[in-house]
């Protein structure tokens, strides 16, 4: 068990803070909830603290919760491939470019680390080149979320990882908006981290609303499990 993994044996409170600017539309979001890495479970509620969110909530899911991939459930035989927990408590910087097909792009940069007993994800997001009447600024996405696989590989040169995946957002007219994600994670501290063999995270997300919440918000339930590395031969013959 890595030193960082020991911090995730129970339920951990999570705080998320985002400052965003998309095509000049500035906004802030605060989120809170908890994560339980034993089950790969996240429960979070996000509120736009600046009024109405200028982009659809589903376009921010990867920035919020795929930001705290340290809550992914890594099966026993894959624990030596869990970069995310091994970087804790000092944490990691997570950077992404997200290309929305036939539309603009987001760049995000986040610091994910422990502050006391709370896992904090502090994010900046800059969006450019979006069409004012497109699927994103035109709010044409359905309020739901598909399952995805998130592919992880080691970046030995930077003592971190690179991550690629393609999100499929459902559009109200029945079509799909693709969002290509290119991610890199770099440890904040200088201590040793686990550099993984290639594998993937399998994610399932459910979006809902709080009937008692008047502000623009999103409630998120997510399950994430690591997969893609088989048991060693010694395991097979036990």
């Amino acid at each position: 068990m890595s030193k960082g993994e020991e911090l995730f044996t129970g339920v951990v409170p999570i705080l998320v803070e985002l400052d965003g600017d998309v095509n000049g539309h500035k906004f802030s979001v605060s989120g809170e909830g908890e994560g339980d890495a034993t089950y790969g479970k996240l429960t979070l509620k996000f509120i736009c603290t600046t009024g109405k969110l200028p982009v659809p909530w589903p376009t921010l899911v990867t920035t919020f919760s795929y930001g705290v991939q340290c809550f992914s459930r890594y099966p026993d035989h894959m624990k030596q491939h869990d970069f995310f927990k091994s970087a804790m408590p000092e944490g990691y910087v997570q950077e992404r470019t997200i290309f929305f097909k036939d539309d603009g792009n987001y760049k995000t940069r986040a610091e994910v680390k422990f502050e006391g007993d709370t896992l904090v994800n502090r994010i900046e997001l800059k969006g450019i080149d979006f069409k004012e009447d497109g699927n994103i600024l035109g709010h044409k996405l359905e309020y739901n979320y598909n399952s995805h696989n998130v592919y992880i590989m080691a970046d030995k040169q930077k003592n971190g990882i690179k991550v690629n995946f393609k999100i499929r957002h459902n559009i109200e007219d029945g079509s799909v908006q693709l969002a290509d994600h290119y991610q890199q994670n770099t440890p904040i501290g200088d201590g040793p981290v686990l550099l993984p063999d290639n594998h993937y995270l399998s994610t399932q997300s459910a979006l809902s609303k709080d009937p008692n919440e008047k502000r623009d918000h999103m409630v998120l339930l997510e399950f994430v499990t690591a997969a893609g590395i088989t048991h060693g031969m010694d395991e097979l013959y036990k």
């Epitope: 400052d19 600017d21 944490g91 910087v93 950077e95 760049k107 995000t108 940069r109 986040a110 610091e111 502090r122 900046e124 997001l125 800059k126 930077k158 971190g160 890199q184 770099t186 904040i188």
Partner: nanobody, 115 residues
Framework: DVQLQESGGGLVQPGGSLRLSCAAS????????MGWHRQAPGKQRELVAS???????NYADSVLGRLTISRDNSKNTVYLQMNSLKPEDTAVYYC?????????WGQGTQVTVSS
């Protein structure tokens, strides 16, 4: 309230060394690209060295091999180690912090290389 506080400047002889520090407060330091710029009297401000949030470094041709930029995220501080200093390195050195959304500057620290 955001502050970038430079220190470590001074008078040094040619061939000597200095270590500049820039302590940041009021920002999420680790997600900022940090840079050292300098401005000599009567000249434009120029980028000397930079280090990204992902710890990639970049240097002006004129300082390659003599200056080294580094960062300590646990101390919210960026450093500039200056070796083999030359009279033409004389300038006010400014610390810059730039993120996706924000851009901040320090007040500067004077470096004078003279015999």
């Amino acid at each position: 309230d955001v502050q970038l506080q430079e220190s470590g400047g001074g008078l040094v002889q040619p061939g000597g060394s200095l270590r500049l520090s820039c302590a940041a407060s009021g920002i999420v330091f680790s997600i900022y690209d940090m840079g050292w710029h300098r401005q000599a009297p009567g000249k434009q401000r120029e980028l000397v060295a930079s280090i990204t949030s992902g710890k990639n470094t970049n240097y002006a041709d004129s300082v390659l091999g003599r200056l080294t930029i580094s960062r300590d995220n646990s101390k919210n501080t960026v450093y500039l180690q200056m070796n083999s200093l030359k009279p033409e390195d004389t300038a006010v050195y400014y610390c810059n912090a730039r993120s996706l959304l924000y851009d901040y500057w320090g007040q500067g620290t004077q470096v004078t290389v003279s015999s």
